[in-house]
């Protein structure tokens, strides 16, 4: 009915779009909720975050397991009182993902 | 002053976070602005889109060149009048990216 090769290509495409940990660029300051007078050099780091598609539109690709990885960055505080300091920054790295439904918000929360 | 190896690692991290085309999963129906009565199987495809960090917070990682790639997908229209059709779907694929300032919105727009 349909060309088997085309179906294979479509299936491979689908496999690659599935919800899974994907390398993503995250901005460290906003990730850590730092004040505007603290910034990092480089401002971004590469980590894995859940992304991709789910079988149902109402499902969300969410992390089921997380590790924290340490990245060495320069922390710069404004006003500049000292030389930029090399600090280890722990950033969340998603190691497992799953398409999950949303739970209703508790009426009293 | 700083350990040369550490600086090398930081620089490599920074290079990898730079604004560039990155493989991304996009939902076809919303990409094409299709009505809720049309959906695709698989619902998502992999294409390259601009992403990553810029040196300044005021800059945005934007596409400077785009190609359109064709993906074979099943288009399913509801009500289902016929068997799902295998159609070529053209999706934007970013081939070049640059950190650009956001254009000021026209005050009268």
């Amino acid at each position: 009915f349909y060309d088997i090769e085309t179906l294979k290509v479509i299936d491979e495409e689908w496999q690659r779009t599935q919800c899974s940990p994907r390398e993503t660029c995250v901005e460290v300051a906003s990730e850590l909720g730092k004040s505007t007078n603290t910034f990092f050099k480089p401002p971004c780091v590469n980590v894995f975050r859940c992304g991709g598609c789910c079988n149902e539109e109402s499902l969300i690709c969410m992390n089921t397991s997380t590790s924290y990885i340490s990245k060495q960055l320069f922390e710069i505080s404004v006003p500049l009182t000292s030389v930029p300091e090399l600090v280890p920054v722990k950033v969340a790295n998603h190691t497992g993902c799953k398409c999950l439904p949303t739970a209703p918000r508790h009426p009293y929360s | 002053f700083y350990d040369i190896e550490t600086l090398k690692v930081i620089d490599e991290e920074w290079q990898r976070t730079q604004c560039s085309p990155r493989e991304t999963c996009v939902e076809v129906a919303s990409e094409l602005g299709k009505s809720t009565n049309t959906f695709f199987k698989p619902p998502c495809v992999n294409v390259f889109r601009c992403g990553g960090c810029c040196n300044e917070e005021s800059l945005i990682c934007m596409n400077t060149s785009t190609s359109y790639i064709s993906k074979q997908l099943f288009e399913i229209s509801v009500p289902l009048t016929s068997v799902p059709e295998l159609v070529p779907v053209k999706v934007a694929n970013h081939t070049g990216c640059k950190c650009l300032p956001t254009a000021p919105r026209h005050p009268y727009s």
Partner: antibody
């Protein structure tokens, strides 16, 4: 066309287990989640959970969490629902339902499970 | 759990006349993605339920255009513009926004 054919009626004793099968045809089995819903005699519909046949991921209604197990056999495009520690309140028609991208769209014909001593 | 309340419980109708069923949810059914997963099913006597309307107002395959859905947030309505004899059965609303998925208690439509 999409078809979900379920196994025949079952009569079970309290405390026993039941396994209902649902054979799918007319679509790519691994591309759609399979949900299970039950309907007690003269009652409404109660959602039990779903399975993603592609990777076997399951999500259960907390009410059934400890007693229900959803599985699939990809080679035969068949989904299974096993309910253990049966009690009389579990007497119901059990449906498998394919989930389209937007909603649960195609239902099996239902399997009546009667729990009686 | 989200409670779905349907009214009326029973709806005697005259063929050719319009009919309306109401469904109210205990919480908003607007998903974080902006969509509303409120669906309507019809269970004809001795049959499995069948999908009529999905995402509030979209008619499913083969569903006649006399059926229409509307509403938002927590209040939804299914309308039949001109009831036909084949429309008898129990109508259920269902929410697919949150888990557990829940259904209304049903509205039995019968010919007068």
């Amino acid at each position: 066309q999409v078809q979900l054919v379920q196994s025949g009626p079952e009569v079970k004793k309290p405390g026993a287990s039941v396994k209902v099968s649902c054979k799918a045809s007319g679509y790519t089995f691994t591309g759609y989640n399979m949900h299970w819903v039950r309907q007690a005699p003269g009652q409404g519909l109660e959602w039990m959970g779903y399975i993603d046949p592609y990777n076997g991921d399951t999500y259960y209604n907390q009410k059934f969490q400890d007693r229900v197990t959803l599985t699939v056999d990809k080679s035969t495009s068949t989904a299974y629902m096993e309910l253990s520690s049966l009690r009389s309140e579990d007497t119901a028609v059990y449906y498998c339902i394919r989930a389209g991208y937007y909603a649960m769209d195609y239902w099996g014909q239902g399997t009546l499970v009667t729990v009686s001593s | 759990d989200i409670v779905m309340t349907q009214t009326p419980l029973s709806l005697p109708v005259t063929p050719g006349e319009p009919a309306s069923i109401s469904c109210r949810s205990s919480q908003s059914l607007v998903h974080i993605n902006g969509n509303t997963y409120l669906h309507w099913y019809l269970q004809k006597p001795g049959q499995s339920p069948q999908l009529l309307i999905y995402k509030v107002s979209n008619r499913f395959s083969g569903v006649p255009d006399r059926f229409s859905g509307s509403g938002s947030g927590t209040d939804f309505t299914l309308k039949i513009s001109r009831v036909e004899a084949e429309d008898v059965g129990v109508y259920f609303c269902s929410q697919g926004t949150h888990v557990p998925r829940t259904f209304g208690g049903g509205t039995k439509v019968e010919i007068k």
